[in-house]
Amino acid sequence: LQDLCSNCPAGTFCDNNRSQICSPCPPNSFSSAGGQRTCDICRQCKGVFKTRKECSSTSNAECDCISGYHCLGAECSMCEQDCKQGQELTKKGCKDCCFGTFNDQKRGICRPWTNCSLDGKSVLVNGTKERDVVCGPSPADLSPGASSATPPAPAREPGHSPQIIFFLALTSTVVLFLLFFLVLRFSVVKRSRKKLLYIFKQPFMRPVQTTQEEDGCSCRFPEEEEGGCEL
């Protein structure tokens, strides 16, 4: 009997009530694979949804969002209201982007302007609610008298290779440490052994925390109201 059902093609179902005959899917239903015992109900595109592809006996309907809305989720399972550029959708509706943020689309959230200084650049064009800032050349490049061409790398002075500089720095550090320990050694004569032990231990002792510090952070941030902008 199972073999009979497996012969039923897509667009039909294996009808148990009719000796497992392959019956066509009834209106507004479909089966996308063969051997199905039931047909699935077609998706209905209603309300904010509009039909992109009609349902057939072998495939489900596909929906899109009506004008003023955009799809969210797999296979456009949700429609979200558009906002204008320079706005974002919050719990209270479409709100303008706060200063320092922008949104160049009708969907999504407001994002912070690019911080040009992080890349060592300057702001060429100021940002708006709808547009990000445009970063230009670094402030140093804009200083008077600076040529637009890249200056040649300065020639290294003879006798100052990185290896020599590193060796001199290392030698100086070792000498300083030796001097430090010699001074401490002589101080043993003047001070007791216990006192010297205290000197060594002191920097590594963990200070006792106050209750407030153990709490983590003492300052509490006020609850931000959705859609409000910080001044």
Epitope: R43, C45, K46, G47, V48, F49, C63, Y69, L72, G73, C76, S77, M78, C79, E80, Q81, L89, T90, K91, K92, G93
Partner: nanobody
Framework: EVQLVESGGGLVQPGGSLRLSCAAS????????MSWARQAPGKGLEWVSG???????YYTESVKDRFTISRDNAKNTLYLQMNSLRPEDTAVYYC????????????????WGQGTLVTVSS
């Protein structure tokens, strides 16, 4: 079968009031979030207001302080009290389930009524 039937629309003068009703059947109304949407002539569909099963209410900016959404779970009915009506409130008003609980967002499983026309004109 899920059914949502709106009523209460009609012609009203600017500054006037109307109360829309939406009779729900075929699902557990008391545990469902509900919403109102509207479509002005030649314009797109606009999310107007929503109410959670627990009673929390949400409104679009343009109707705040003028419209009030409410529900009567015993009667399986959703209401929209509209006061200080303006000509720009003229639209077909739809009642819909609101499974996403998100402002301006509906899902494919949400159900819609056929709508009731509200005309604000002198």
């Amino acid at each position: 079968e899920v059914q949502l039937v709106e009523s209460g629309g009609g012609l009203v003068q600017p500054g006037g009031s109307l109360r829309l009703s939406c009779a729900a059947s075929g699902f557990t109304f008391s545990s469902s979030a509900m919403s109102w949407a509207r479509q002005a002539p030649g314009k797109g569909l606009e999310w107007v207001s929503g109410i959670y099963s627990g009673g929390s209410t949400y409104y679009t900016e343009s109707v705040k302080d003028r419209f009030t959404i409410s529900r009567d779970n015993a009667k399986n009915t959703l209401y929209l009290q509209m006061n200080s009506l303006r000509p720009e409130d003229t639209a077909v008003y739809y009642c819909a389930t609101w499974g996403t609980l998100r402002f301006g967002v509906w899902a494919e499983y949400d159900h819609w009524g056929q709508g009731t026309l509200v005309t604000v004109s002198s």
